[in-house]
């Protein structure tokens, strides 16, 4: 058993049918010695008396808010949560496996630049009695500070028969060094509590590996005289790191016909313009990627040819 | 070239070669099935490789003030990786394919390090840790780790030379 926060404790259980569970001793936080009784949750049934209460915690019915009283007055509370270990592996009931980029990916994170700011998100089908707490650091043995905000519900979508809820959090490395080569990964730890179930999820990454630039901005077409060709131009997204002579992007320009089956023409360039042939009813799209490190491409910025 | 006395390197040449290094490093080790190398044990890891750190002056301001600190750091790293790529980690079993980019990568690391330091002038170089994995699978894992680490290193070096070519060339 360990303390999650003041008066909230996590009991770790080896979870299998007929498991013996864990013996837990609760102590009433009071100078009083006599006339103390214990109850669980809203029940008025007295579970025991005395300054300490010894219980055998086996299942969720044994978890909850234990309260010690004296003469009708509440003295203190202890909330017991359960953390299930199933055959040596901590349970992952609360969050959905996003399966991208690999199985057992519960947390996904992205950064728009090298400033040390990043966003993480996760999915669940649970709509109520759910709380999250997020901590982060650079490295784990001698951790350097990363400050995370509160996790918020960022999207809801219907998937088949049930609803899916997306939560996200923004974090910022306290002393980021955008130009340095990272040697210690960022660690992100999410505590999830659903009713009386506790779970924790972690992710470890380098900012360089989660970079995904915003799409190029101000995408424009300039027809070239007496030609089917057009000059496409664009600019670096505002959110990308500066100076651009140091934090350079490379670009992919694509001409795509109306039908998805039509052949796509693609051009790669380090410049912020390119000359392409504009077909009728086609659209021109441009996306960006770090020039020197193959992290994710941005989403496409698009304009119609006409 | 970064000659004794601290004159400027051939920024544009360095830029071209460092960008080529980035391409080679990624073709030598693309993201193989998203193998998470940080999860793959640290018993024979590449933690001892030289990293371009915050105080090494490789940021735009540091380069403007005095690029020599940064160039020395990059040179150290180039020599370090050049030696690693020439070691039995890469020459031993399992043999690299004949058309593997590792050979080109090795030669380009040497080429860029020579651009930065002509003969007769010596910056101190970092000692290579004695990494001699016994099993072929350990060697394979170490190759992946070294190449992933090299990708990060040459990305920073390429940024330095791109910025230098754009802003510090005479």
């Amino acid at each position: 058993i360990w303390e999650l926060k003041k008066d909230v404790y996590v009991v770790e259980l080896d979870w299998y049918p007929d498991a013996p569970g864990e013996m837990v001793v609760l102590t009433c936080d009071t100078p009083e010695e006599d006339g103390i009784t214990w109850t669980l949750d809203q029940s008025s049934e007295v579970l025991g008396s005395g300054k300490t209460l010894t219980i055998q915690v086996k299942e969720f019915g044994d978890a909850g808010q234990y309260t010690c009283h004296k003469g009708g007055e509440v003295l203190s509370h202890s909330l017991l949560l359960l953390h299930k270990k199933e055959d040596g592996i901590w349970s992952t009931d609360i969050l959905k496996d996003q399966k991208e980029p690999k199985n057992k990916t519960f947390l996904r994170c992205e950064a728009k630049n090298y400033s040390g700011r990043f966003t993480c998100w996760w999915l669940t089908t649970i709509s109520t009695d759910l709380t999250f707490s997020v901590k982060s650091s650079r490295g784990s043995s001698d951790p350097q500070g990363v400050t995370c905000g509160a996790a918020t519900l960022s999207a809801e979508r219907v998937r088949g028969d049930n609803k899916e809820y997306e939560y996200s959090v923004e974090c910022q490395e306290d002393s980021a060094c955008p130009a340095a080569e990272e040697s210690l990964p960022i660690e992100v730890m999410v505590d999830a509590v659903h009713k009386l179930k506790y779970e924790n999820y972690t992710s470890s990454f380098f900012i360089r590996d989660i970079i995904k630039p915003d799409p190029p901005k101000n995408l424009q077409l300039k027809p070239l005289k007496n030609s089917r060709q057009v000059e496409v131009s664009w600019e670096y997204p505002d959110t990308w790191s500066t100076p651009h002579s140091y934090f350079s992007l490379t670009f992919c320009v694509q001409v795509q016909g109306k039908s998805k089956r039509e052949k796509k023409d693609r051009v790669f360039t380090d410049k912020t313009s390119a000359t392409v042939i504009c077909r009728k009813n086609a659209s021109i799209s441009v996306r960006a990627q770090d020039r020197y490190y193959s992290s994710s491409w941005s989403e496409w910025a698009s304009v119609p040819c006409s | 070239r970064a000659v004794p006395g601290g004159s400027s390197p051939a920024w544009t040449q360095c830029q071209q070669l460092s960008q080529k290094l980035c391409t080679l490093a990624w073709s030598a080790h693309p993201l193989v099935g998203h193998m998470d190398l940080r999860e793959e044990g640290d018993e024979e890891t590449t933690n001892d490789v030289p990293h371009i750190q915050c105080g090494d002056g490789c940021d735009p301001q540091g380069l403007r003030d005095n690029s020599q600190f940064c160039l020395q750091r990059i040179h150290q790293g180039l020599i370090f990786y050049e030696k690693l790529l020439g070691s039995d980690i890469f020459t031993g079993e399992p043999s690299l394919l004949p058309d593997s980019p590792v050979g080109q990568l090795h030669a380009s690391l040497l080429g860029l390090s020579q651009l930065l330091q002509p003969e007769g002038h010596h910056w101190e170089t970092q000692q290579i840790p004695s990494l001699s994995p016994s099993q072929p699978w350990q060697r394979l894992l170490l190759r992946f780790k070294i190449l992933r680490s090299l990708q990060a290193f040459v990305a920073v070096a390429a940024r330095v030379f791109a910025h230098g070519a754009a802003t510090l060339s005479p």
């Epitope: 080896d14 979870w15 299998y16 049918p17 007929d18 498991a19 299942e59 969720f60 270990k85 199933e86 055959d87 040596g88 592996i89 009931d93 690999k102 199985n103 057992k104 089908t125 | 999860e39 793959e40 044990g41």
Partner: antibody, heavy 115, light 112 residues
Framework: QVQLVESGGGVVQPGRSLRLSCAAS????????MHWVRQAPGKGLEWVAF????????YYADSVKGRFTISRDNSKNTLYLQMNSLRAEDTAVYYC????????WGQGTMVTVSS | QSVLTQPPSVSGAPGQRVTISCSGS????????VKWYQQLPGTAPKLLIY???QRPSGVPDRFSGSKSGTSASLAITGLQAEDEADYYC????????????FGTGTKVTVLG
């Protein structure tokens, strides 16, 4: 004491269907994940499928994906395996078992796929 | 196709010590715990070892398990006639859990 009893096995022709049941008693069935494991005659153990305690997630071996469906009815304390498009290579003893460090197995039910 | 490899058979005289190996990789045994089962002819598997080296109550202390790196082993000391059975190791893969990975199985024969 935990008890698992499989039923529903038998002889079936290739391409046909069969539904296996596993009746659980002696524990809070709705709190635990459950597996189906099979063993072809004279062969080793092969995992078939898993279902979470609440039925929210199901996992299958590649060899049965798209043909077999695992389900559970927690109100009846029963686990099911719906087997469609049966093949000769599905011939085996099918066991249900609880998920956890200390597991409990049923006695098994024999499924024979033969023309 | 099992990814946990065991020897097809091992044998020993009564009273002897035999060991069964179970070889996996970093993503399965290297990252997860190992169980061992005993299966007597015509019966369901019986748990012998869990969490690499723990014995459930009722299992004789002649059976012991260990794990090192990407391999695990089961040792039977003071071999007895009733130990003649098939033995299976089981683990999980880091990326496919909760799918069970079983070893190929080992037939233990008690000689004489």
């Amino acid at each position: 004491q935990v008890q698992l009893v499989e039923s529903g096995g038998g002889v079936v022709q290739p391409g046909r269907s069969l539904r296996l049941s596993c009746a659980a008693s002696g524990f809070t069935f709705s709190s635990y994940g459950m597996h189906w494991v099979r063993q072809a005659p004279g062969k080793g153990l092969e995992w078939v499928a898993f279902i979470r305690y609440d039925g929210s997630n199901k996992y299958y071996a590649d060899s049965v994906k798209g043909r077999f469906t695992i389900s559970r009815d927690n109100s009846k304390n029963t686990l099911y395996l719906q087997m469609n498009s049966l093949r000769a290579e599905d011939t085996a003893v099918y066991y249900c078992k609880t998920h956890g460090s200390h597991d409990n197995w049923g006695q098994g039910t024999m499924v024979t796929v033969s023309s | 196709q099992s990814v946990l490899t065991q020897p097809p058979s091992v044998s020993g005289a009564p009273g002897q010590r035999v060991t069964i190996s179970c070889s996996g990789s970093r993503s399965n045994i290297g990252s997860n715990t190992v169980k061992w089962y005993q299966q007597l002819p015509g019966t369901a598997p019986k748990l012998l070892i869990y969490y690499n080296d723990q014995r459930p109550s009722g299992v004789p202390d002649r059976f012991s398990g260990s794990k090192s790196g990407t391999s695990a082993s089961l040792a039977i000391t003071g071999l007895q006639a009733e130990d003649e059975a098939d033995y299976y190791c089981q683990s999980y893969d880091r990326y496919t859990h909760p799918a069970l990975l079983f070893g190929t199985g080992t037939k233990v024969t008690v000689l004489g």
